[in-house]
Each structure stands twice: as C-alpha cells, then as structure tokens.
C-alpha cells in the first residue's frame, strides 16, 4: 500500500513539476525591467526565451519573437536546449510511469516489469528536474552578470550633455516557476525510484521437499526457491532528467482607442 502511495504521489508531483517546466519555458517573464532605483519609465520591458515584450502604461503590449537563431547569445540557446531536453525527458517519463503505476493493470504485466518502468521514469524525472534547474540557474547567472555590468556603466554619454539610460533587467516570474517546477520533478523522480524498490518482488527460498519412504506420512516443508527477477535486493537504482521548449509568433494586443487600460 505504501509503495502504491509513494509511486502515485511521485507521479503526481512529477506531473505538476513537468507542467511547471513547460509553463516556465513558455513564459515571457524570464527577465523583467528593474524598476528599483532606476529612472521610472512609462514603458515596462520583459523578456522570455522566445520573445521580448513591451507593455506601455496605456495597456498596449507588443511582443516580438526572436526570429533569428544564429544571432542569439550562446547562453540563451543553451538554456533553451536544457529546457527542451527537460520537457522531452519529462514527457517520456510521464508516459512510461503511467504504464508503471501499480493501480493500473495492463494485460499480465509482471511486477518486475512495472518496477523496471518505475525506475526508468524516476531516473527520467530526476534528469528532467536537473535540466530545468540548470537552465533556469544559467539564465539567472547571466542576468546577475549583466545587471552588475549595466549598473557599472548605467549612464553612458552620447556626445555632449545627452545621456541615455541603460535598461537593467532582473529575475522574472518564470525563473521562480522554473526552480520550483524543477525541484518538484526531481522530488517526484526520487519518489518513483524509492517506489521501484518496493515493487521488486521479495526473494523467497524454497527448501528441499523431503520424502520418507518408510512411513505413510509425508512431511512437506516449504522453503526458499530463489526468484530471479533482475531486481536483486542489491540492485542499485539509477537516475535520469528533463527540460522544455516552445516558439511564439509576434503578438500584439492593441487597446482600442475607445478602451483605456
């Protein structure tokens, strides 16, 4: 019962985590304009992995996709790749874990096969979670570096008295969603790996049956036939991992001239 609960909970936690990784990957708020100690503007900038957006105080929001692959920073490409790998592994892990669930009967699938699948999905969830955490952390590190670089030369002279204010970016909501989601997927994966150990059939020994020819009474002693399942008690659990992706076209949400925000 505890094994089923652990497996089920691991599945649910991973499912929530992967949904979060997908959401984070799709979100536009990976980095948002820093409003602290900055000349306040009537325009708010924020950026995602796939597009950058501008929201005016009028309510008009305009998003432009990054319609280039080669022109993008290598770090951004790396983050995209990590998130995509995380989502793909997570999705496969979910698919495998559905069939591995103890509460679901599929034909005459043995417990040993379910245990194998549970371990596989657990490893996939772990790798998926690690990918997401790594992707978000790389992006966060990139932001911190750029933040302090732009702070150092916040006001750059543009010839004479004219000044241009550099926009600084700070952590967006997607980073926190990604960290939490990656953590949940990781925890879910660990739970699946733990459940896998409980699913592996116990070793049972059948001692030899002894027949006494002299007497009429036959003594039968059950004993220890060793079941070979491929999951011995000393079998080590392995681990795996996932990420996410998505592209978006340029989107513009226009406020009607007669519809103020």
């Amino acid at each position: 019962m505890a094994v089923t609960a652990c497996q089920g909970l691991g599945f649910v936690v991973s499912l929530i985590g992967i949904a979060g990784i997908i959401a984070a990957t799709c979100m536009d708020q990976w980095s948002t304009q820093d409003l602290y100690n900055n000349p306040v503007t009537a325009v708010f900038n924020y950026q995602g992995l796939w597009r950058s957006c501008v929201r005016e105080s009028s309510g008009f929001t305009e998003c432009r996709g990054y319609f280039t692959l080669l022109g993008l920073p290598a770090m951004l490409q790396a983050v995209r790749a990590l998130m995509i790998v995380g989502i793909v592994l997570g999705a496969i892990g979910l698919l495998v874990s559905i069939f591995a669930l103890k509460c679901i009967r599929i034909g005459s699938m043995e417990d040993s096969a379910k245990a194998n699948m549970t371990l596989t999905s657990g490893i996939m969830f772990i790798v998926s979670g690690l990918c997401a955490i790594a992707g978000v952390s790389v992006f966060a590190n990139m932001l911190v570096t750029n933040f302090w670089m732009s702070t150092a030369n916040m006001y750059t002279g543009m010839g004479g008295m004219v000044q241009t204010v550099q926009t600084r970016y700070t952590f967006g909501a997607a980073l926190f969603v990604g960290w939490v989601a990656g953590g949940l997927t990781l925890i879910g994966g660990v739970m699946m790996c733990i459940a896998c150990r409980g699913l592996a059939p116990e070793e049972t020994n059948y001692k030899a049956v002894s027949y006494h020819a002299s007497g009429h009474s036959v003594a039968y002693k059950p004993g220890g036939f060793k079941a070979s399942t491929g999951f011995g008690s000393n079998t080590k659990n392995k681990k795996i991992y996932d990420g996410g992706a998505r592209t978006e076209d340029e989107v513009q949400s226009y406020p009607s001239k007669h519809d103020y925000v």
Epitope: S58, T167, P255
Partner: antibody, heavy 117, light 113 residues
C-alpha cells in the same frame, strides 16, 4: 464617441482648495487618466495620472504635496483636488485619456481655475 | 526631469510652404525593447485642448492629414508640414512619453505671413 467632460470654471481664494471632475463616456473606463495644467500663454505641464482599474496614481514631484487624484467608478469620473492654492495656480486644467505610445488621444475641454482674493 | 526643447519658438510661413519644427530631448526616448521612440506631437488652437497628431515619433494618428509627418530618433525629432494650410495655424507641442514625469516642450507657434 469617446468624451471626457470636465466641470465648469472655478474662482477660488488663495490658500483654499479646488476639486475638479472629469467624466468619461463612450469607452470602457479602465485606462489611465492624466491631468495637465496650462497657465495663461504658457506651455503644457503634466500633473499626474490615475488608473481607474486599481486607483493607483503617479504624480509629478512638483505637484505631489498639493494634488490628490481620486475616482468614482460608478459614475466613471476622475477627480483632481488641488490644495493651498496660490495666484500662480491660475490656469486651465485638462484631463486626458491615454492611447498608444502613452500619448493623449482624448482631452477634456479644460477647466479654468482662477485664484484671486 | 527630461527637458524638451522646441525650436523655433515661433515662425511665420506662406501658404503651401514646407515647414519643419524641431524638438530635442535631454535623454534618449528610444526604448530598446521595441525600438520605438516615445515622442508625441500635438497641435493646439486658441481656446481648445491639444489634439494628437503623431505618436511613437512617426505614427500619424487616424484622421490627421498626411501633410503632417514625424521623424527622428533618440533625442532629435522633427514635425514636418509638407504644405501649410490656413487651418494649420496653431501652437505645436512635443511630449516625452517615456520618462516620468512626462514632460512637454515649450511649444512652437506657427503663423501665416
């Protein structure tokens, strides 16, 4: 069509307060409404703005201590109260609705406030 | 605060003439996020509220005659009237719509000779 209708002209004494209104009609009352002052023969000066959705407001530091922007959603009306009036506050006060590029597409007809003893 | 400087203060032109009004800001009004300049032009006739002509430095408001055009980027902007008509006599204001407080230029008064 979109209309911003302002209250009538006011004559007030120095040190007193005045509360001007700006009633919006012909559109969804959700966008920032701005207030602008124009002294006789002078240019335009931004006073502040209020968001009818959440009543959040931003003010020009120059007017912050003396100006209060409020609203009544039930009547789609924005109010601007200016206190401690001085003779240099004699001007036409406009309310304006925001549009693309944070520009002001719709303007009230203006309210002339005369500060005189 | 951002200082908006308009030039000239006033000018008198003949009907049909081409006229250029200038506006300079003390800081760049270009937003890197969408590559748009947050500068607006208004026309104000005596006894009337201002009327929106151009936003985003070059986008003409619907209903505004096409003889009005805006250009410029960063800190230097111009409003051009390709062929001045009698009804164009007014004061023209430029506005910073990017930084708070939103600021206006002193205005340029256009008259007919």
């Amino acid at each position: 069509q979109v209309q911003l209708v302002q209250s009538g002209a006011e004559v007030v004494k120095p040190g007193a307060s005045v509360k001007l209104s700006c009633k919006a009609s012909g559109y969804t009352f959700t966008n920032w409404v701005h207030w602008v002052i124009q002294a006789p023969g002078q240019g335009l000066e931004w006073i502040g703005e209020i968001n009818p959705t959440n009543a959040r407001s931003n003010y020009n530091e120059k007017f912050k201590k003396r100006v209060t922007l409020t609203l009544d959603r039930s009547t789609s009306t924005v109010y601007m109260e200016l206190s401690s009036l001085r003779s240099e506050d004699t001007a036409v006060y406009f309310c304006a609705g925001i549009y693309y590029g944070n520009s002001f597409a719709h303007w009230g007809q203006g309210t002339l406030v005369t500060v005189s003893s | 605060d951002i200082v908006m400087t308009q030039s000239p203060d006033s000018l008198a032109v003949s009907l049909g003439e081409r006229v250029t009004l200038n506006c300079k800001s003390s800081q760049s009004l270009l937003n890197a996020g969408n590559q748009k300049n947050y500068l607006t032009w208004y026309q104000q006739k005596p006894g009337q509220p201002p009327k929106l002509l151009i936003y985003w430095s070059s986008t003409r408001e619907s209903g505004v005659p096409d003889r009005f055009s805006g250009s410029g980027s960063g800190t230097d902007f111009t409003l051009t009237i390709s062929s001045v008509q009698a009804e164009d006599v007014a004061v023209y204001h430029c506005q910073n719509n990017y930084y708070y407080p939103l600021t206006f230029g002193g205005g340029t008064k256009l008259e007919i000779k």
